[in-house]
Interface confidence: low
């Protein structure tokens, strides 16, 4: 008996074949020998089967001794054996249908578990396994599931049903909501504008939610909120707003925040959390502002830092075109009695340059200019 | 019958693309999905790719992720196979074929790149 | 990723002896094996699928066995024009990849 493998809501075709290649009659049964169609010379008749208004043939093969049964928008139960009579003959076809579908929603936040459910035919014993578009393969039964989804597991998840050594394929699109970035770091002189944005890993058509930001500045005790707002249709609206600092958010996405000036009292780190209507979970996007200011005191010269800076980091002051005056794996750095010219001030991670701060030093009976 | 017919062989400098297109004939377009195979001169087959026409979804060999793109049209029946970032190892027989679950029944007559500087 | 290995990668033989090749997967693969024949200058022909299945069309005297991780391609009685090479592939997950091959030359 010829197995053959189908995909709920899919079309299938069960072939059958005349050893004579023309029109003669035929017609298909189910197993319980109830009339699905046949001919009769040329027309095509219906029986008083379920499959009434979802059964067809191809009567262009007819001519050829062709005569497939095309069974439209499949359905679970409409697994069955199915027997074409042609020519004193049997042919019997065994469909099994199979359905695949995603737990609730196929829009999941990061960190959240998808389970997938195989809905299939009574007496069949399939086994399923599924690739992530990330290449990762799970293997199960009628349920699989992947706990604490990644953004790399947004995409077309591919299935493969395997039964009586056959197979059938679903393809089922994921899309897990994050932010294109866990975390992020701004490094800022004193006194710039400093640019915070929040890249959403996805796109939907409405997107409709509420966030806030707090803030926790390395020197202040506790953190705060800095930003409240809505999100509707991705229009964003601010609700409340710390007056200091003086933040301005964008009103479309992506999310995004100006701070007027970076100042060392605002260095410190950020949580942005985004909470989705009819989502269970928020989404976050960790933020990190570093600032650096150069200084000279009668005759000390200092650069600082402040803000959260890996131990790596090297803090360096030299004077232009020379090698560094000092180099430290810390938050401050000085020279005392600098010559004069052109100093600069750089944080660098493993010789490349995150911020540079440039201070000149006049001779001696000059007052510093800062460019 | 099932016919796939390719565009003709292409010669390119080393670093340019190649866009290999494979027509299908005499069969439902979007029921099955059009595998790419190329074959180096002298060497055995590699398995570079799939695309289903039904809803241009794709995969491919993890090696070629990032330079490979496939796309179709499904207005013509054909199915377009994007090589970028070419180099002299990328010198091949393109093959189209159709894919049955895994296997391919029905083949194009294959195109033969040549990356040369 | 699956990987098959092929054997022998070359062979000699006569018109008329029964020649076998063997395709071991590196997992198990079920069924969803496919073997090739493939003529210089032309595109592969497939010869079986689902591992012991004949394509339409394809002479009888060829024949596949095995499940799980080996597979066996025969041909019971070499005919001149099946002097080629043949190829092995697996069909259970992407990407299918291809044995190396095993060129089948006259003795």
């Known amino acids: 008996k010829k197995v053959v493998l189908g995909k709920k809501g899919d079309t299938v075709e069960l072939t059958c074949t005349a050893s004579q290649k023309k029109s003669i009659q035929f017609h298909w049964k189910n197993s319980n020998q109830i009339k699905i169609l046949g001919n009769q010379g040329s027309f095509l008749t219906k029986g008083p089967s379920k499959l009434n208004d979802r059964a067809d043939s191809r009567r262009s093969l007819w001519d050829q001794g062709n005569f497939p049964l095309i069974i439209k928008n499949l359905k679970i139960e409409d697994s069955d054996t199915y027997i074409c009579e042609v020519e004193d003959q049997k042919e019997e076809v065994q469909l099994l249908v199979f359905g695949l579908t995603a737990n609730s929603d196929t829009h999941l936040l990061q960190g959240q578990s998808l389970t997938l459910t195989l809905e299939s035919p009574p007496g069949s014993s399939p086994s399923v396994q599924c690739r992530s578009p990330r290449g990762k393969n799970i293997q199960g039964g009628k349920t699989l599931s992947v706990s604490q989804l990644e953004l790399q597991d947004s995409g077309t998840w591919t299935c493969t049903v395997l039964q009586n050594q056959k197979k059938v394929e679903f393809k089922i699109d994921i899309v897990v909501l994050a932010f294109q970035k866990a975390s992020s770091i701004v490094y800022k002189k004193e006194g710039e504008q400093v640019e915070f944005s929040f890249p959403l890993a996805f796109t939907v058509e409405k997107l409709t939610g509420s966030g806030e930001l707090w803030w926790q500045a390395e020197r202040a005790s506790s953190s705060k909120s800095w930003i409240t707002f809505d999100l509707k249709n991705k229009e964003v609206s601010v609700k409340r707003v710390t007056q200091d600092p003086k933040l301005q958010m964008g009103k479309k996405l992506p999310l995004h925040l100006t701070l007027p000036q970076a100042l060392p009292q605002y260095a410190g780190s950020g949580n942005l959390t985004l909470a989705l209507e009819a989502k269970t979970g928020k989404l976050h996007q960790e933020v990190n502002l570093v600032v650096m200011r150069a200084t000279q005191l009668q005759k000390n010269l200092t650069c600082e830092v402040w803000g959260p800076t890996s131990p790596k980091l090297m803090l360096s002051l030299k004077l232009e075109n020379k090698e560094a005056k000092v180099s430290k794996r810390e938050k401050a750095v000085w020279v005392l009695n600098p010559e004069a010219g052109m100093w600069q001030c750089l944080l660098s991670d493993s010789g490349q340059v995150l911020l540079e701060s440039n201070i000149k030093v006049l001779p001696t009976w000059s007052t510093p200019v800062q460019p | 019958q099932v016919q796939l017919v390719q565009s003709g062989a292409e010669v390119k400098k080393p670093g340019a693309s190649v866009k290999v297109s494979c027509k299908a004939s005499?069969?439902?377009?979007?029921?099955?999905?059009i595998a790419w195979v190329r074959q180096a001169p002298g060497q055995g087959l590699e398995w570079m790719g799939i695309?289903?026409?039904?809803?241009?979804?794709?995969s491919s060999a993890q090696k070629l992720q990032g330079r490979v793109t496939m796309t179709r049209d499904t207005s013509t029946s054909t199915v377009y196979m994007e090589l970028s970032s070419l180099r002299s190892e990328d010198t091949a027989v393109y093959y189209c074929?159709?894919?049955?679950?895994?296997?391919?029944?029905?083949w194009g007559q294959g195109t033969l790149v040549t990356v040369s500087s | 990723d699956i990987q098959m290995t092929q054997s022998p990668s070359s062979l000699s033989a006569s018109v008329g002896d029964r020649v076998t090749i063997t395709c071991r997967a590196s997992?198990?693969?079920?069924?969803?094996l496919a073997w090739y024949q493939q003529k210089p200058g032309k595109a592969p022909k497939l010869l079986i699928y689902?591992?012991?299945t004949l394509q339409s069309g394809v002479p009888s005297r060829f024949s596949g066995s095995g499940s799980g991780t080996d597979f066996t391609l025969t041909i019971s009685s070499l005919q001149p024009e099946d002097f080629a090479t043949y190829y092995c592939?697996?069909?259970?997950?992407?990407?299918?990849?291809f044995g190396q091959g095993t060129k089948v030359e006259i003795k």
């Open positions: 074929a159709r894919d049955r679950l895994g296997d391919l029944d029905y």
């Open positions: 005499g069969g439902t377009f979007s029921r099955y999905g």
């Open positions: 695309s289903y026409p039904s809803d241009g979804s794709t």
């Open positions: 997992q198990s693969i079920s069924s969803w």
């Open positions: 689902a591992a012991s």
């Open positions: 592939q697996q069909g259970y997950s992407t990407p299918y990849i």
